[in-house]
């Protein structure tokens, strides 16, 4: 960066090189050039010469003042106009940054995705800081009182093998950057309560010719968890509102859910599951599209289709459950 150049003087920033966005700042440039009494001192920001708010302080020093500085990063350097020199002489340069202190991390969440071997902890970091912000995740066993710390820039994956202090833990997050430090509330977790089943996937759909044509959605999960609750939501792509079907599932076999849908309409389906009675859901599965036939013939749709999307109707299913209407987005 600009800070690696050979200097013939000194450049510095007040109040600091990293400062709060929107502050008034002063950048000082002091020349120390052999055989040069600078006639003028010039400032450059990102290669553009600054024209305004430059004040000469003394023979060797000038100040550039910025009001309400809002740029997250800028490269500054200054030059001198020396008598008998045709070109400006470089004095020094500095990278400056502006941003915000971190907000208090909130919505700390830790989950174990089945088969991952990791506990994944996430949080809401709050507003963008614009500057380098580090997070320390503290994990303290409630049984042994042993505490471990993990440094990260965003979320953290902690190997479940390293969680040797039993099943109950306190987790909290500390956020810190050059402008401040904040700490979240403590989250109490039990490892058995935070497991999210292996992802449920819709594999195919078929519409069967019958007196009243019906569509069967086939879906499955590799989970070994016995008691799993799932939701399937669907809608015609032209609609806004999802219809949601809830059911208890045993994944010892591929699930089949029946829907009585309108002909010649494109539908979109998604599924998600959780361990029954626990807190955390899987994210909704990938969008699965199926267009119902105009009338009689059997139509099969396969998984991993990608298409434009966007809504719903009435349903029946081999699984037990009930129908609800839903405007929810993806909720954890």
């Amino acid at each position: 960066g600009i800070t690696n150049i050979n200097c013939s003087g000194h450049i510095w920033v007040e109040p600091a090189t990293i400062f709060k966005m929107g502050m008034n700042i002063s950048i000082y440039c002091q020349a120390a050039i052999k055989n040069c009494q600078p006639r003028k001192l010039h400032f450059y920001k990102n290669g553009i010469k600054e024209r305004f708010q430059i004040t000469r302080i003394n023979k060797t020093t000038a100040r550039l003042w910025y009001k309400n500085f809002l740029e997250p990063h800028a490269s500054m350097y200054c030059t001198a106009e020396c008598p008998k020199h045709f070109q400006e002489t470089l004095i020094c340069g500095k990278d400056i940054s502006s941003g915000y202190p971190p907000d208090i991390p909130d919505e700390v969440t830790c989950v174990i995705y089945e088969y991952s071997g990791n506990m994944t902890c996430t949080w809401n970091a709050g507003k963008l800081t614009y500057i380098d912000t580090k997070y320390v995740v503290h994990v303290k066993s409630l049984e042994t009182e042993e505490e471990q710390q993990y440094l990260t820039s965003s979320y953290i994956n902690i190997s479940t093998d390293s969680l040797q202090g039993g099943k109950k833990y306190l987790v909290w997050v500390q956020a810190a950057n050059a402008l401040g430090m904040e700490e979240s509330k403590q989250l109490q977790i039990h490892l058995d309560d935070i497991v999210i089943p292996s992802a449920a996937v819709i594999s195919r759909a078929e519409t069967i010719n019958a007196t009243v044509p019906k569509t069967i959605i086939y879906w499955d999960s590799q989970t070994t968890i016995e008691k799993v609750s799932c939701e399937m939501r669907y809608k015609a792509t032209t609609n806004q509102t999802w219809n949601v079907k809830e059911f208890d599932t045993n994944f010892t076999y591929v699930q089949q859910s029946e829907f009585y849908l309108e002909p010649n309409i494109k539908y979109v389906f998604q599924v998600r599951c959780q361990e029954t009675g626990k807190r955390y859901w899987q994210p909704w599965s990938s969008l699965f599209f199926h267009k119902t036939p105009e009338t009689v013939p059997q139509v099969t749709s396969k998984a991993f289709q990608h298409d434009t999307w966007n809504s719903g109707l009435t349903v029946a299913s081999i699984s037990t459950g009930h129908l609800t209407s839903d405007n929810r987005g993806d909720i954890g």
């Epitope: 600078p38 006639r39 003028k40 010469k49 024209r51 305004f52 430059i54 004040t55 000469r56």
Partner: antibody, heavy 119, light 107 residues
């Protein structure tokens, strides 16, 4: 050699607008700052507006007396400087000179164009 | 903005006289000073820049000196064509500012 030719001056009523032009030749227009300096009858020289060179990203300056009324601009493809003067007042009556600066002193000047604001 | 005060505001002199015009800045301008000559109905003409550097084509009877806040334009031997108004300009800090002018008249 450097040549600056102003045009667009004339007699105008208070509150009306006028646009001055300055056609430049004989130097690298992009690399120089361009200014409008005015001289009221029998008075001294005053910098009215300035548009800087490419190295300054064409930063503009206006004297407090003309801020929000005058607009300086340049067309680098035509080597021409402009001054759009709106809401003219009697005190804007002056000879308007186009001037060139590479450093910050004015190296070359046009012959001037007279603007008279009178009802 | 930096204020420039020129003195005298006018002077009468004869051909062959040595004439001195001074310009004082409201703060140190580090030799960033130019001098201009203006004749009636004409545009100003650059004589001196950087306090003491003579612009190409300007007769050597014109010279400039000074540092800090005080600067001088000297015409060593006044010629008939030198009767005009002279202005100083500081370009140390933006925006550049002019002195109010010194009129050199025939005695």
């Amino acid at each position: 050699q450097v040549q600056l030719v102003e045009s667009g001056g004339g007699v105008v009523q208070p509150g009306r607008s006028l646009r001055l032009s300055c056609a430049a030749s004989g130097f690298d227009f992009n690399s120089y700052g361009m200014s409008w300096v005015r001289q009221a009858p029998g008075k001294g020289l005053d910098l009215v507006a300035d548009i800087n060179s490419k190295s300054y990203n064409y930063a503009t300056y206006y004297a407090d007396s003309v801020k929000d009324r005058f607009t300086i601009s340049r067309d680098n493809s035509k080597n021409t400087l402009y001054l759009q003067m709106n809401s003219l007042r009697a005190e804007d009556t002056a000879v308007y000179y186009c001037a060139v600066h590479h450093s910050d002193y004015f190296e070359y000047w046009g012959q001037g164009t007279l603007v008279t604001v009178s009802s | 903005d930096i204020q420039m005060t020129q003195s005298p505001s006018s002077l009468s002199a004869s051909v062959g006289d040595r004439v001195t015009i001074t310009c004082r800045a409201s703060q140190d301008i580090y030799t960033n000073l130019a001098w201009y000559q203006q004749k009636p109905g004409k545009a100003p003409k650059l004589l001196i820049y950087h306090a003491s550097s003579l612009q190409d084509g300007v007769p050597s009877r014109f010279s400039g000196s000074g540092s800090g806040t005080d600067y001088t334009l000297t015409i060593s031997s006044l010629q008939p064509e030198d009767f005009a108004t002279y202005y100083c300009l500081q370009d140390s800090e933006y925006p550049p500012t002019f002195g109010q002018g010194t009129k050199v008249e025939i005695k």
